[in-house]
Each structure stands twice: as structure tokens, then as C-alpha cells.
């Protein structure tokens, strides 16, 4: 006879799974806020900065109250992948001025990567349909100047901050419905 069957797979508690994802998201939100403040202190921002390659804010996609878990997780994962790519690009091409934001920018990248893996795990544990692999994104053009790199950093950290807030609010709201 073959080996004895393993213990039955315990179905995960979705509230606990969501909890640990919210914790990571909140932690990353605090890191992002701190880094954005650091950037503002060193290079004060004049008004809003935008970067066309960044995802449009998820919160404009509709009222939070109408969201469903698969939609939130899929959208959040896609947006965070884009931000991860932008943070990597910033570290690589942002110029010497942004070197003053190391090692914090590197830590942010690592935590962003960790949250993405956590979201992937959450989606598989909750048996949500996995999104298709992302098509390769066109490379981001290097900033036109040192100031261009700084403006891009303001846009990336500001957008990430708002996206993470949307995520925390959406996930906690969904948790109340489980």
C-alpha cells in the first residue's frame, strides 16, 4: 500500500488571510509616506506631479462600496506590479540626486515585492481565478534631466501612497462583509 494520506488540507480563514495582507499593505503605506516626506524635504514639490506611464488611480474606477474581492485583488496586483517596475526604474535611471533616498528606496522595492507575493498567495488560497501573465511592458524612457527624475519620484511615491490607501480601505471594507 502507498503512503498514508496526508492530513486534510485546512481551508484558509479568509478573514485571517485578508488580515495579514492588510497588515503588509499598511506597513508599506507607512514606509511610502515616510519616503515621500523625505523626498519633499530634500526636493520640495511644486504642485501635483504626473507620469503618464503610471496606472490611473484605482479609486476612480468606482465607489468602494461596490467592489468585490476578486476585482480588488486583481486590480491591486496589476497596479502594484506597475509601481514595482517604476521604483526599479527610478533606482536605476533616477540620477545621482535620488541616490540620497537609498537605502530606503531599496527597502521600499523589497516590501512592494513581498506584498505582491502575498497577494498572489492570497488569490490562490482563496481559489480566485489567476490573472493571465502580464505582457512585457515597454521599457520606461530615462528622465530627460535630473529634475525630471525628481518629478518622477514625486509622482511615483504620491501615486503609490494613494493606491495603498485605496487598498487598505477596500480590503478592510471587504473583510466586514466576509
Amino acid at each position: 500500500p502507498g503512503p498514508p494520506p496526508g492530513p486534510p488540507r485546512v481551508s484558509p480563514d479568509p478573514r485571517a488571510e485578508l488580515d495579514s495582507t492588510v497588515l503588509l499593505t499598511r506597513s508599506l503605506l507607512a514606509d511610502t509616506r515616510q519616503l515621500a516626506a523625505q523626498l519633499r524635504d530634500k526636493f520640495p514639490a511644486d504642485g501635483d506631479h504626473n507620469l503618464d506611464s503610471l496606472p490611473t488611480l484605482a479609486m476612480s474606477a468606482g465607489a468602494l462600496g461596490a467592489l468585490q474581492l476578486p476585482g480588488v485583488l486583481t486590480r491591486l496586483r496589476a497596479d502594484l506590479l506597475s509601481y514595482l517596475r517604476h521604483v526599479q526604474w527610478l533606482r536605476r535611471a533616477g540620477g545621482s540626486s535620488l541616490k540620497t533616498l537609498e537605502p530606503e528606496l531599496g527597502t521600499l522595492q523589497a516590501r512592494l515585492d513581498r506584498l505582491l507575493r502575498r497577494l498572489q498567495l492570497l488569490m490562490s488560497r482563496l481559489a480566485l481565478p489567476q490573472p493571465p501573465p502580464d505582457p512585457p511592458a515597454p521599457p520606461l524612457a530615462p528622465p530627460s534631466s535630473a529634475w525630471g527624475g525628481i518629478r518622477a519620484a514625486h509622482a511615483i511615491l504620491g501615486g503609490l501612497h494613494l493606491t495603498l490607501d485605496w487598498a487598505v480601505r477596500g480590503l478592510l471594507l471587504l473583510k466586514t462583509r466576509l
Partner: antibody
């Protein structure tokens, strides 16, 4: 100086609606959420809901869903809370408060708006 | 919803004394090193004022005689040496889940 200035006291009849404004100054309006808190006489403080001025839907305490409506006018750095179908138990002081994104602690408060519901 | 219970309901002390205010949550409001409890002070006719956020962080402009501690379900606000202006009502609030809720308050009175 960071400030939230609310509209004046209101007296309303049962069944009516009230809309309170909250004008923010001294900080970047879109960097924080705007939360609303109720303080009825002899009752504990109650969170009504919040809104991110950058856009998207507000979120509400289930107890107030359907009766409270939170909106913002980003260009005027002003938040609004409308409460409909008023009843006597809505008599309270209503505060707007600046909320830290993702953490729901409130580091700046408006002076409060007293709403009295009486026939 | 998470229920916060504060004790005592009122406390009479003299200036210079140490005040210890307690807040107990109906379930844990801590996760992996973060405790989502915040403390406010409110004086009659005024709005609440943030004193402590995330259990132990002193809010901007708050004197160092105020401190917060605790984790899990039990939290404490300590005022090391009471000043005249500290006599007020104190509220704890959690933000572990939605909706955030407040305790019923502890009234600190002059003896």
C-alpha cells in the same frame, strides 16, 4: 497653521436633511482622508465614515449607510457631510477630522457643528 | 464591531500626581508589532485632540509627560505628573478593523 473650519449650528425638523461643510487649510488637502465623527450628548464618539479627497467612493460605518453622504470639492479644499431623514437621536455635535491614510487616527479636528433635531 | 471599555469611568487626582488610564478591547487590536490604538483628550466645548497614535507614538506638540503602552487587548495612557490643564476627558480609539470605534471615556477631575 493647519485648520479645519466647519459651518455653523443647525436646527432641523424630523425628516429633514442637513449638510455640514468643513474647509481645510494649511496642508495639502489630498494628502489625508477626511473623516466625520458624531458626538451625541452622553454617548461615546461614533465614526460616521471617511472620504479620500483624491477621488473614489467614501466608506461608511454601516450604521450610517444610506443616510450619510460624504462629498468633497477638491478645488475649494472643502469636505461635506449630508445627513438625511433626521430624527431626534441625530441631535449631536458633528466633527470633521483629518485622517491619516490607511490608519484612521485623527490628528486635526474641526471645531464641531451642533445639529439639533426638534419638532 | 470591536468594543473598547475604559476604566475607571472617572478619576480624581491632584496636580503633580501620576495618572494611569486603562482601555480594554473586546478582541486583539495588535498585529505583528503594530497596535492600532489611539488616545485623545477632550475638554468641555472643545473638539478632541490627538495625544498618542499607534499605542505609543506621541502626537505632534503633545508634552512628554503623556505616554502610551500596551498590546493585544490591554492599553494604558499614563500622565507622569499632572498639570492643571490635563484635567479633561480621555478617549481611546481603535483602527484595527472597520469601523473604528471609541471607548466611553475616562473623566479626570481635580481632587
Amino acid at each position: 497653521e493647519v485648520q479645519l473650519v466647519q459651518s455653523g449650528a443647525e436646527v432641523k425638523k424630523p425628516g429633514a436633511s442637513v449638510k455640514i461643510s468643513c474647509k481645510a487649510s494649511g496642508y495639502t488637502f489630498t494628502d489625508y482622508n477626511m473623516d466625520w465623527v458624531k458626538q451625541a450628548p452622553g454617548q461615546r464618539l461614533e465614526w460616521i465614515g471617511d472620504i479620500n479627497p483624491h477621488g473614489g467612493g467614501p466608506i461608511y460605518n454601516q450604521k450610517f449607510t444610506g443616510r450619510a453622504t460624504l462629498t468633497v470639492d477638491k478645488s475649494a479644499s472643502t469636505a461635506y457631510m449630508e445627513l438625511s431623514s433626521l430624527r431626534s437621536e441625530d441631535t449631536a455635535v458633528y466633527y470633521c477630522a483629518r485622517g491619516e491614510l490607511g490608519h484612521w487616527y485623527f490628528d486635526v479636528w474641526g471645531q464641531g457643528t451642533t445639529v439639533t433635531v426638534s419638532s | 464591531d470591536i468594543v473598547l471599555t475604559q476604566s475607571p469611568a472617572s478619576l480624581a487626582l491632584s496636580p503633580g500626581e501620576r495618572a494611569t488610564l486603562s482601555c480594554r478591547a473586546s478582541k486583539s487590536v495588535s498585529t505583528s508589532g503594530y497596535s492600532y490604538i489611539h488616545w485623545y483628550q477632550q475638554k468641555p466645548g472643545q473638539a478632541p485632540r490627538l495625544l498618542i497614535y499607534l499605542a505609543s507614538n506621541l502626537a505632534s506638540g503633545v508634552p512628554a509627560r503623556f505616554s502610551g503602552s500596551g498590546s493585544g487587548t490591554d492599553f494604558t495612557l499614563t500622565i507622569s505628573s499632572l498639570e492643571e490643564e490635563d484635567f479633561a476627558t480621555y478617549y481611546c480609539q481603535h483602527s484595527r478593523d472597520l469601523p473604528p470605534t471609541f471607548g466611553q471615556g475616562t473623566k479626570l477631575e481635580i481632587k
